[in-house]
């Protein structure tokens, strides 16, 4: 399986909420001996290997934000800790998983990584990740809503999210 990032760049004004999304593609084993570990973290810009460094999101580590479940099951993060930080990660049975960040500030700008680890009991792990950038813009001419840029587009194609 692979991880797809529908959008490579999210541009949002301060105070807005945003949902960053990844999608699991390809055949997903739904056997009883297979579980999926999905999580989110921040990483540094301009690394040779994107997403190799794992930094917390609003002081929450990738362990705090992880989802652990069987193939194509829905799941949500434990609400208390994450929601106190304005965060919620979720996964649906279509292979989409996301992190929602509320009340964005400039400090949320950066590179975000989703990580999926397929864990086969008594076998090796298979891990894949996706990367996307969030820019939280300030100033009177920042967009009024989030604007997302599809990963397939390198230039000015964009979509305004309500």
């Amino acid at each position: 399986f692979k991880v797809a990032t529908p959008y490579s760049l999210y541009v949002c004004p301060e105070g807005q909420n945003v949902t960053l999304t990844c999608r699991l593609l390809g055949p997903v084993d739904k056997g009883h001996d297979v579980t999926f570990y999905k999580t989110w973290y921040r990483s540094s810009r301009g690394e040779v290997q994107t997403c190799s460094e794992r930094r917390p999101i609003r002081n929450l580590t990738f362990q705090d934000l992880h989802l652990h479940h069987g193939g194509h099951q829905a799941a949500n993060t434990s609400h208390d800790l994450a929601q106190r930080h304005g965060l919620e990660s979720a996964s649906d049975h279509h292979g989409n998983f996301s992190i929602t960040m509320r009340n964005l500030t400039l400090l949320d700008s950066g590179l975000y990584c989703c990580l999926v680890v397929e864990i086969r009991h008594h076998h090796s792990e298979h891990r894949v990740h996706g990367a996307m950038e969030l820019q939280v813009q300030t100033g009177k001419d920042a967009p009024s809503n989030c604007v997302v840029y599809p990963s397939s587009s390198q230039d000015s194609e964009n979509i305004t999210a309500a």
């Epitope: 400039l106 939280v136 813009q137 009177k140 001419d141 920042a142 604007v147 587009s153 194609e157 964009n158």
Partner: antibody, heavy 119, light 111 residues
Framework: QVQLVQSGAEVKKPGASVKVSCKAS????????MHWVRQAPGQGLEWMGR????????VYNQNFNDRVTMTRDTSTSTVYMELSSLRSEDTAVYYC????????????WGQGTTVTVSS | DVVMTQSPLSLPVTLGQPASISCRAS??????????MNWFQQRPGQSPRRLIY???NQGSGVPDRFSGSGSGTDFTLKISRVEAEDVGVYYC?????????FGQGTKLEIK
């Protein structure tokens, strides 16, 4: 990879205007602010202003407020900086630079455009 | 406007030796608990290049020998061991608020 390619050198007479272009590639053009910085011969760097290519919004350094105009053309991923009423002190290298909100800094710079103002 | 003052303006250094450049802002450049102080390198005949952003974060591709520190109004750029390719002018810049002002520049040369 991110590239900012600027237009070629210009020679202008005092009182004239100059329009410098900066063509961006390798990233979503409207997702990042673009700034302009100039450098007079043997001098330091001076911030002139910036444009948000998404909606054309601008902020100018008040030192240039009445003489500088920044525009963009999203169809060609190009930003422009026009400086009017040129004087000899405007002789400088003009740079465009992409701005990121992840750390608030100019992460990629154009190669520079030399503008010479001489009678 | 925030005035940025660098010292020294000229810095002769022996290859392999450390170097240090100071930058003082006329007012606090902190915002959201972060000092928005950046450092740029300009080699002879080239465009400026990002070195350090938000006080201490290295730009991509920047050698580990470059580091930044400080907070509030006083900041420092350090080069642990100067190499020949480090020759050029170094600028500090505050990005807390516009106009985004630069220091006068420090010219680093090899003794």
């Amino acid at each position: 990879q991110v590239q900012l390619v600027q237009s070629g050198a210009e020679v202008k007479k005092p009182g004239a205007s100059v329009k410098v272009s900066c063509k961006a590639s390798g990233y979503p053009f409207t997702g990042y602010f673009m700034h302009w910085v100039r450098q007079a011969p043997g001098q330091g760097l001076e911030w002139m202003g910036r444009i948000n290519p998404y909606n054309g919004g601008t902020v100018y350094n008040q030192n240039f407020n009445d003489r500088v105009t920044m525009t963009r053309d999203t169809s060609t991923s190009t930003v422009y900086m026009e400086l009017s009423s040129l004087r000899s002190e405007d002789t400088a290298v003009y740079y465009c630079a992409r701005w990121t909100f992840d750390g608030l800094f100019m992460d990629y710079w154009g190669q520079g455009t030399t503008v010479t103002v001489s009678s | 406007d925030v005035v940025m003052t660098q010292s020294p303006l000229s810095l002769p250094v022996t290859l392999g030796q450390p170097a240090s450049i100071s930058c003082r802002a006329s007012e606090n450049v902190d915002k959201y608990g972060i000092s928005f102080m950046n450092w740029f390198q300009q080699r002879p005949g080239q465009s400026p290049r990002r070195l350090i952003y938000a006080t201490s974060n290295q730009g991509s591709g920047v050698p580990d020998r470059f580091s930044g520190s400080g907070s509030g109004t006083d900041f420092t750029l350090k080069i642990s061991r100067v190499e020949a390719e480090d020759v050029g002018v170094y600028y500090c810049q505050q990005s807390k608020e516009d106009p985004y002002t630069f220091g006068q520049g420090t010219k680093l040369e090899i003794k």
